[in-house]
Amino acid sequence: MAQWNQLQQLDTRYLEQLHQLYSDSFPMELRQFLAPWIESQDWAYAASKESHATLVFHNLLGEIDQQYSRFLQESNVLYQHNLRRIKQFLQSRYLEKPMEIARIVARCLWEESRLLQTAATAAQQGGQANHPTAAVVTEKQQMLEQHLQDVRKRVQDLEQKMKVVENLQDDFDFNYKTLKSQGDMQDLNGNNQSVTRQKMQQLEQMLTALDQMRRSIVSELAGLLSAMEYVQKTLTDEELADWKRRQQIACIGGPPNICLDRLENWITSLAESQLQTRQQIKKLEELQQKVSYKGDPIVQHRPMLEERIVELFRNLMKSAFVVERQPCMPMHPDRPLVIKTGVQFTTKVRLLVKFPELNYQLKIKVCIDKDSGDVAALRGSRKFNILGTNTKVMNMEESNNGSLSAEFKHLTLREQRCGNGGRANCDASLIVTEELHLITFETEVYHQGLKIDLETHSLPVVVISNICQMPNAWASILWYNMLTNNPKNVNFFTKPPIGTWDQVAEVLSWQFSSTTKRGLSIEQLTTLAEKLLGPGVNYSGCQITWAKFCKENMAGKGFSFWVWLDNIIDLVKKYILALWNEGYIMGFISKERERAILSTKPPGTFLLRFSESSKEGGVTFTWVEKDISGKTQIQSVEPYTKQQLNNMSFAEIIMGYKIMDATNILVSPLVYLYPDIPKEEAFGKYCRPESQEHPEADPGSAAPYLKTKFICVTPTTCSNTIDLPMSPRTLDSLMQFGNNGEGAEPSAGGQFESLTFDMELTSECATSPM
């Protein structure tokens, strides 16, 4: 099916992203009208070779003409009009630079395919991404259910056969002993010779039948164990491994992981079948002790069957011991696996074999870096002790679903101090936020005469001693869990693997979607790709090193990509969450694209984006205005940082923002939020009504209080303001008189504004870089 047709069938949330992909520079109608032809061209090649771009561009115009004549025959006036308009636009814009249109189309096609890929992945991971925990049963899982049912049935069938063989054996034993006691066996020469011979034949026949049945049971047991092994492999190597991978993904902001209950039911069912089978194998031993003979299959095969069932059960129990909730500080629920020394963290383990007889029987002990004592010393890692309640008994009462689990709520880490400030070795090759540690959980199970040592461990954690290390620590957690499903590679950062843009893009989007109501659009991600990788057409498959992601400073900046982005994430969550959720913040957009989309819009159209120069995270707005000569200008205000947003909400800043023109008149340059949403409609609801801004005046006082209002003003007294950020000045107060400012008519007392600036207005233009 053509890519465009596939896209039409996607969920609304994906179609929204598709809409964001298209703009005037490559209209969606054109994509629709010429879908098959557009998809058949090599745009990426055209984007890199001018001669080919020219050829493709002329062919495109030809295709438009052909489509136009089709609409002519169909008398479709609207489509004719649109197509003529599109052709004129393309000619005026790209005739001289055909490589530019090729680059735009190539990028759109790539982003489309990425969108399809994302949708397909979400579907595979359990249906609707808006119901990620929904219990969607895949075909594979149905097969698994079937296999488990088959195992249970075979166990029950064997139970019946065991009863039958026991009956036959008891009957044989009875007959044998009766004949023996009556001395019939010796009496073959006597009068009863034929009767005795007949009885002996019957006895031999019974023994043959018994042997056949025993062989059949032994063979069926071997087959059953193979079936169990297959189901167990599917459960542990696929289903449980999938759950663990999904847990990693959920830890780094991806879709929430599915609940473990179904997996627990499957594993418990298999464990029950295994114990029943073990009892059957024990029963064989009893039978053999009562009656045995030369070539007895029980003697031959039972020890191996016993060994296999014990091994299977042991391994199943070991696999079933999992970390249900990875270590996490309660104050940072969205950043698990980063632990600050001295700060409590919680974690939870669960045994997916739900045997009531194990309730309150398993004592779990927690420790850190259990197996890496020597390795840690060699590597120069820090060493830690776990403080707090580090043992807990597993029980079924604490969890609301009755699972056998133990939750540790009061654990803390303390660094073991060494002579050289805590590092076990001065030559430590890794910085502390790249040092990975494992928290291990151990217990012993005694069940039906078996002793099984259980051990599981958390995903690698990063231990910090200061909260300022959180951004880099979190980057390490992202990089690790994005690139490996190895649960315990503590040496990961000695040679960190390279990620692809597709992987990084998805994880970056999760950083927003996990704590806000929206992830990053294709357009936003493309801007981020440009920041990381430079200008390009198709970022898919492009490689990103760990250093580039979070260690090296960005070109011309004094900070890394990740530090910059993490501060923006923080800014969004703490200061502009509602606006981000509404989709009002374009956020990541290149200067070129910003200019392209705003330059065709009427004056007063503005958009909101993040500052590229502010390390601490800043947000700014850019608007369109006409200068004296009527020429379109694009202006940006100096970014607002967390410090400023602490004092005044961004919505209020936007609503109140003014510029002071040369004649000292205050004008609001922000009218429509891009593309055409009236400012009041978008931001009005996020501003406090003026009546609530201050308490009522003292009723006993002679005159009402004057109301004040903070607004931001930018003076525009210079002519060279094009594209330079404008520095906002706070207009200290705008005072209104009359009836507390509520519904006062000008005639009833008038309104006037008194302007006070909290800093001297200067005529220089702000030139801080963006």
Epitope: V164, V165, N167, N175, K199, M206, A209
Partner: nanobody, 126 residues
Framework: HVQLVESGGGSVQAGGSLRLSCVAS?????MGWFRQAPGKEREGVAA????????HYTDSVKGRFSISRDYVKNAVYLQMNTVKPEDAAMYYC??????????????????????WGQGTQVTVSS
């Protein structure tokens, strides 16, 4: 659950012989034969326990019919000799898991579950 499949029925002349066979899906302690003539109640004919190898017979067939078992094939056989017109009936193979199958089972007073075959018809011409 035990499945029973009979064979060997048919027409036999009075005074002649016939051999009925029945194969069970699994081993049972007790196997036997019952019959039902039109308009009459089902009656026990012969049974053989897995213990003691002694057959039990209803009085009317003693000395003429002989029951035997093959433990390997899980089969029971009824050898019918000197057949009489009153032997004509539908013959049913029966089995039960316990080994007690003497007269009490044949006269249907024994407890416990009995499994039945579909039956095989025996007709006697004079």
């Amino acid at each position: 659950h035990v499945q029973l499949v009979e064979s060997g029925g048919g027409s036999v002349q009075a005074g002649g012989s016939l051999r009925l066979s029945c194969v069970a899906s699994t081993y049972t302690g007790c196997m036997g034969w019952f019959r039902q003539a039109p308009g009459k109640e089902r009656e026990g004919v012969a049974a053989l326990s897995s213990r003691g190898f002694a057959g039990h017979y209803t009085d009317s067939v003693k000395g003429r019919f002989s029951i035997s078992r093959d433990y390997v094939k899980n089969a029971v056989y009824l050898q019918m000799n000197t057949v009489k017109p009153e032997d004509a009936a539908m013959y049913y193979c029966a089995a039960r898991e316990g080994w007690e199958c003497g007269e009490t089972w044949l006269d249907r007073t024994a407890g416990g579950h009995t499994y039945w075959g579909q039956g095989t018809q025996v007709t006697v011409s004079s």
